[in-house]
């Protein structure tokens, strides 16, 4: 008799999820020699243990602590790049600017980026049919809790000047409900972080507006200032040129504003 299975509103676990996580872990430790000591089988076991046999609407940060412990990694605290709604450009930037790191450049972020996963209460099965949607089903689902946990830890680790890349094409350039707005902003440590510098990325070719004057950026400045952290903001009018100039800073066209 087929067992009744909970139907959730979100897509199911990414196909080949266990194999993908394990392979990404192995590749990461190969690319980053400082993480060679990591036992990827143990990492996968801890990852699996966080959500398997648990109700996918009842996951806690505590469930991920064994994984957090195994994935502990020291990144230079003054080289952290946060982002909101502009992931691809942030990742392109850190591929070129090798001494800066997004969350997805760390082991745990690299393992999970763009994947979905969930289990079922009281069975050891992974649910490949559907997983809870944050809005329609529940917020304490395996994926959301994972990103909340690693994002909080990443922000807590930051020091000196922290950069954040924001999407100037969105109606809310700063969104209080994004992971950046709801988790990372509130977990920057004022005793360690001197300044949050926002880079507002322009989308349009002819867009010369000063998006640092946008009301949502002013709202971000207010939140940050109240936390005793300084705030600064820069417009990146030409993201393509910006990347090119990060790659080749000596290029003569890179002295002008980007």
């Amino acid at each position: 008799v087929p067992r009744w299975r909970q139907q959730w509103s979100g897509p199911g676990t990414t196909k080949r999820f266990p194999e993908t996580v394990l392979a990404r872990c192995v590749k990461y430790t190969e690319i980053h020699p400082e993480m060679r000591h990591v036992d990827c089988q143990s990492v996968w076991d801890a990852f699996k243990g966080a959500f398997i046999s648990k109700h996918p609407c009842n996951i806690t940060e505590e469930d991920y602590q064994p994984l957090m412990k195994l994935g502990t990694q020291t990144v230079p605290c003054n080289k952290i790049l946060l982002w909101s709604r502009i992931k691809d450009l942030a990742h392109q930037f850190t591929q070129v600017q090798r001494d800066m790191f997004t969350l997805e450049d760390t082991l745990l972020g690299y393992l999970a980026d763009d994947l979905t996963w969930c289990g079922e209460f009281n069975t050891s099965k992974i649910n490949y049919q559907s997983c809870p949607d944050w809005r329609k089903d529940c917020s304490n689902n395996p994926v959301s809790v994972f990103w909340k946990t690693v994002s909080r830890r990443f922000a807590e680790a930051a020091c000196d000047v922290v950069h954040v890349m924001l999407n100037g094409s969105r109606s809310k350039i700063f969104d209080k409900n994004s992971t950046f707005g709801s988790v990372e902003v509130h977990n920057l440590q004022p005793e360690k972080v001197q300044t949050l510098e926002a880079w507002v990325i322009h989308g349009g070719r002819e867009d010369s507006r000063d998006l640092c004057q946008d009301p949502t950026i002013k709202e971000l400045e207010s939140i940050i200032s109240k936390r005793n952290i300084q705030f600064s903001c820069k417009n990146i009018y030409r993201p393509d040129k910006f990347l090119q100039c990060v790659k080749n800073p000596e290029d003569s066209s890179c002295t002008s504003e980007i």
Epitope: R16, E19, T20, V21, L22, A23, R24, K27, D88, H91, Q92, Q95, V96, R98, D114, L243, K247
Partner: nanobody, 117 residues
Framework: QVQLQESGGGLVQPGGSLRLSCVAS????????MGWYRQAPGKQRELVAR???????NYADSVKGRFTISSDNAKNTVYLQMNNLKPEDTAVYYC???????????WGQGTQVTVSS
Amino acid sequence: QVQLQESGGGLVQPGGSLRLSCVASERIFSRNTMGWYRQAPGKQRELVARIASLGITNYADSVKGRFTISSDNAKNTVYLQMNNLKPEDTAVYYCNYWHYAAGRDYWGQGTQVTVSS
């Protein structure tokens, strides 16, 4: 399924040069990388060099300054220019495509490089 086609191997004298090519059926994008590994008889396969989508490179210490990896994204091709070859560079050279999203390594059939006088 990514297909890889290697070429350019052969026999060369110490101090000589070779250029390996590898054409992929899919372009390098996002966090995918292409690279070259080698396996000498009785030894484990080891990384020689890899290149990411934006031209970022990694090299094994043993080949730094002698080998250069490059790519032509328009042709989905990665090259390995090998100069000042040494007998210890003798191995089968394998083209590798790491597909980040799928968490999969794809491999070419391998091309033999022999450095001998």
